[in-house]
């Protein structure tokens, strides 16, 4: 059965450049290994932001990526992207792959539009 991936349509990053959003898939398959990839879509181009593989024992992901973190629980991944600036505003897609055991399944969310507003610089104080 096909997996459907859902994620919020819009998220506003914090003033510190941090955006958090869930990525969920259904139906929940009995899977030992789930790979989650965050992609950024600009025009017709897609670029990988970060990727990780979750297992029953390894539920904290993206350890190789300084700007991404995430936790996995059942069929839900809570994603956090940090270090965002206004130029990073865009559509971020969550791709979920059920890697093991076979069969392989893949699904992609419709994307989360992350809006990032750079904080105003502090005025000089006399």
């Amino acid at each position: 059965e096909a997996i459907q991936v859902t994620q919020p349509s819009v998220v506003l990053a914090s003033s510190h450049g941090v955006a958090s959003f869930p990525c969920e898939y259904s139906p929940s398959h009995n899977t030992d290994e789930v790979r989650v990839t965050v992609l950024r879509q600009t025009n017709d181009q897609m670029t990988e932001v970060c990727a990780t593989t979750f297992t029953e024992k390894n539920t904290v992901g993206f350890l190789d990526y300084p700007f991404c973190s995430g936790t996995f629980n059942e069929s839900r991944v809570n994603l956090t992207i940090q270090g965002l600036r206004a130029v990073d505003t865009g559509l971020y897609l969550c791709k979920v792959e059920l890697m093991y055991p076979p069969p392989y399944f893949v699904g992609m969310g419709n994307g989360t539009q992350i809006y990032v507003i750079d904080p105003e610089p502090c005025p000089d104080s006399d």
Epitope: E1, A2, I3, Q4, V5, E33, L39, M46, E48, K95, M99, Y100, P102, P103, Y104, F105, V106, G107, M108
Partner: antibody, heavy 119, light 108 residues
């Protein structure tokens, strides 16, 4: 430019073995999933197997499970298909193909190598 | 296993005419993970469309893909002489990654 060159095909008797190779160049081989797809004479395309970029995950079509093994050598940019217990119905042109980075469709293909299983 | 059915089996048309090729899946798969390929005799297949509707690099805009769920369509707006070939659809949403049986587009 991306190039995939298969080799190792030939005529083999039923029950015997054969190993196909696919030499890849023009891209970062270790970043892509790689597939074998076959085509029997005058017939359509049949996906055979895939191996993920790091070699950890492999999937096969049911008809070759337990007989064929896909593997890769990322240091030599080479993909392999070990075919054991060959049957007449395995006769086909075997293509290696690159799985596109964002989904397992095939953006580059080799020219194919013909495997004929006959007594 | 997802079974793909293509229709018609053969399409006989003249250059300049439009062609509509259908691909139907036995069950739905995720995110429109469907591709179309063109194959000419003695050659390897060539990717035309992925993601049901995105044209691959270098593919002319007379080729377009559409559809979702279980029903997909490849449209060739005006057939050029080099377009006469066999066309295959393929799903890559779940393993095994199956192909349809193909539609042959030949010259009337």
């Amino acid at each position: 430019q991306v190039q995939l060159v298969e080799s190792g095909g030939g005529v083999v008797q039923p029950g015997r073995s054969l190993r196909l190779s696919c030499a890849a160049s023009g891209f970062t081989f270790s970043s892509f999933g790689m597939h074998w797809v076959r085509q029997a004479p005058g017939k359509g395309l049949e996906w055979v197997a895939v191996i993920w970029y790091d070699g950890r995950n492999k999937y096969y079509v049911d008809s070759v499970k337990g007989r064929f093994t896909i593997s890769r050598d990322n240091s030599n940019n080479t993909l392999y298909l070990q075919m054991n217990s060959l049957r007449a119905e395995d006769t086909a042109v075997y293509y290696c193909a690159r799985g596109e980075f964002f989904g397992e469709f095939f953006d580059y293909w080799g020219q194919g190598t013909l495997v004929t299983v006959s007594s | 296993e997802i079974v793909l059915t293509q229709s018609p089996g053969t399409l006989s048309l003249s250059p300049g005419e439009g062609a509509t090729l259908s691909c139907r899946a036995s069950q739905s798969f995720s995110s429109n993970y469907l591709a179309w390929y063109q194959q000419k005799p003695g050659q390897a297949p060539r990717l035309l469309i992925y993601g049901a509707s995105s044209r691959a690099t270098g593919i002319p805009d007379r080729f377009s893909g559409s559809g979702s769920g279980t029903d997909f369509t490849l449209t060739i707006s005006r057939l050029e002489p080099e377009d006469f070939a066999v066309y295959y659809c393929q799903q890559y949403g779940t393993s095994p990654f199956t192909f349809g049986p193909g539609t042959k587009v030949d010259i009337k």
